[in-house]
Amino acid sequence: MAVTACQGLGFVVSLIGIAGIIAATCMDQWSTQDLYNNPVTAVFNYQGLWRSCVRESSGFTECRGYFTLLGLPAMLQAVRALMIVGIVLGAIGLLVSIFALKCIRIGSMEDSAKANMTLTSGIMFIVSGLCAIAGVSVFANMLVTNFWMSTANMYTGMGGMVQTVQTRYTFGAALFVGWVAGGLTLIGGVMMCIACRGLAPEETNYKAVSYHASGHSVAYKPGGFKASTGFGSNTKNKKIYDGGARTEDEVQSYPSKHDYV
C-alpha cells in the first residue's frame, strides 16, 4: 500500500513539475525590466526564451519573436536546449510511469517489469528536473552578469546633460516557476525510484533447513525455491534492492552577455 502511495504521489508530483517546466519554457517573463531607477515607467519591457515584449500603460502589449537562430547568444540557445530536453525526458517519463503504476493493470505485466519501468521513469524525471534547474540557473547567471555590466555604465550622455538610461533586466516569474517545477520533477523522480525498490521481487537465498516430516525427510539447500515442491516460485510481494538513482554529469555555466533583443 505504501509503495503504491509513494509511486502514485511520485507520478503526481512529477506531472505537476513537468507541467510547470512546460509553462516556464513558454512564459515570456524570464527577465523583466528592473524598475529600481524608474518605478513609474509608462513602458515595461520583459523577455522570454522565444520573444521579447513591451507592455504600455495604455494596456497595449507588443511581442516580437526572435526570428533568428544564429544571431542569438549561445547561452540562450543552451537554455532553450536544456528546457526542451527536460520537457521531452519528462514527457517520456510520464508515459512510461503511467504503464508502471501499480494501480493500473495492463495484461499480465509482471511486477518486475513494473519495477523496471518505475525506475526508468524515476531516472527520467530526475534528469528532466536537473535539466530545468540547470537551464533556469544558467539564465539567471546571465541576468546577474548583465545586470552588473549595465549598472557599471548605467548613464551615458553629453557632459552629463542628457541621460540615456540603459534598460536593466532582473529575474522574471518564469525563473521561479522553472526552479520550483524542476525541484518538483526531481522530487517526483526520487519518489519513483524509492517506489521501485518496493515493487520488484527479491531473490532471497535461504540457509539449508531440515524438516522432519512424517514418513520422509526433505533437505532444502541454498539456491532459492526454484526446485522445491509445495512452495513454487511465487515472487509476489518480495523486495528487490536496486542501486536507485544514477548521478548525472554536472552542468557548468559560464557568464555570458544576455543582450539578444
Epitope: 509608462a42 513602458v43 513591451v54 500603460s57 494596456g59
Partner: antibody, heavy 118, light 113 residues
C-alpha cells in the same frame, strides 16, 4: 462616435474640495486607460493623473499627489477626479482623455473649468 | 522628471511654406525593448482641446494629413509641416509618453504672416 463629457467644475474656495466627472460613450470604456489633463489660462497642458482600465494602476503628477484621487466606475462608463485641499494654482480647465496605444491621449473632452479663489 | 524643451516658442509663416519645429527631452525616450521613441505631438487650436497628431515619434494618427511628419530619436525630435495651410495655425506641443509624469513641452505657436 467617441464622446467625453466633463462636469463638476466651478468656483471653489482655497482649501476646498470638488469632484469632477467624465461621462464616456461611443467606445468600450472598460477596455481603455483614462487620464485627466489640466490647462491653466494661457499655459500649456499639464498631465494630472492616469488610471488603467481595471483601476489597479494609478499615477499622479507630484503636485497633486495626496490631494487628488482618480477613480472610475466601469459599469457607469464614468471617470472621476476628486480634488481636495485646492490651491489657487489648481485653477485650470480640466480635460478627461482616453489613453491608448503609444501611451497617448487620442480623444479629449471639451473640459470643465475649475477656479480656486476666495 | 523628464523635461521637454520646445523651440522656437513661436513661428511666423506664409501659406505653402515648409515649417520645422524641434523638441528636446532631458532623457532618452527610446525604449530598447521595441526600438520605439515615446514622443507624441499634439496640435491645439484656440478654444479647443489638444488633438493627437503623431505618436511613437513618427507614426501619424489616422486622419492626420500627410504634410505632417515626425522624426528624430533618443532626445532630439522634429515636427515638419511640408506645406502650411491656414487651418494649421495652432500651438504644437510635444509630450513625453515614456515615463511618469507625462510631461509636455511649452509649445510652439504657429502664426500667419
Amino acid at each position: 462616435e467617441v464622446m467625453l463629457v466633463e462636469s463638476g467644475g466651478g468656483l471653489v474656495q482655497p482649501g476646498g474640495s470638488r469632484k469632477l466627472s467624465c461621462a464616456a460613450s461611443g467606445f468600450t470604456f472598460s477596455d481603455y486607460g483614462m487620464a485627466w489633463v489640466r490647462q491653466a489660462p494661457g499655459k500649456g497642458p499639464e498631465w494630472v493623473a492616469f488610471i488603467n482600465n481595471l483601476a489597479y494602476s494609478i499615477y499622479y503628477v507630484d503636485t497633486v499627489t495626496g490631494r487628488f484621487t482618480i477613480s472610475r466606475e466601469n459599469a457607469k462608463d464614468t471617470l472621476y477626479l476628486e480634488m481636495s485641499s485646492l490651491r489657487s494654482e489648481d485653477t485650470a480647465l480640466y480635460y478627461c482623455a482616453r489613453f491608448t496605444t503609444g501611451n497617448v491621449m487620442d480623444y479629449w473632452g471639451q473640459g470643465t473649468s475649475v477656479t480656486v479663489s476666495s | 522628471d523628464i523635461v521637454m524643451t520646445q523651440s522656437p516658442s513661436s513661428l511666423t509663416v506664409t501659406a505653402g511654406e515648409k515649417v520645422t519645429m524641434t523638441c528636446k527631452s532631458s532623457q532618452s525616450l527610446l525604449n530598447g525593448g521595441n526600438q520605439k521613441n515615446y514622443l507624441t505631438w499634439y496640435q491645439q487650436k484656440p478654444g479647443q482641446p489638444p488633438k493627437l497628431l503623431i505618436y511613437w515619434s513618427s507614426t501619424r494618427e489616422s486622419g492626420v494629413p500627410d504634410r505632417f511628419t515626425g522624426s528624430g530619436s533618443g532626445t532630439d525630435f522634429t515636427l515638419t509641416i511640408t506645406s502650411v495651410q491656414a487651418e494649421d495655425l495652432a500651438v504644437y506641443y510635444c509630450q513625453n509618453s515614456y515615463s511618469y509624469p507625462l510631461t509636455f513641452g511649452s509649445g510652439t505657436k504657429l502664426e500667419l504672416k
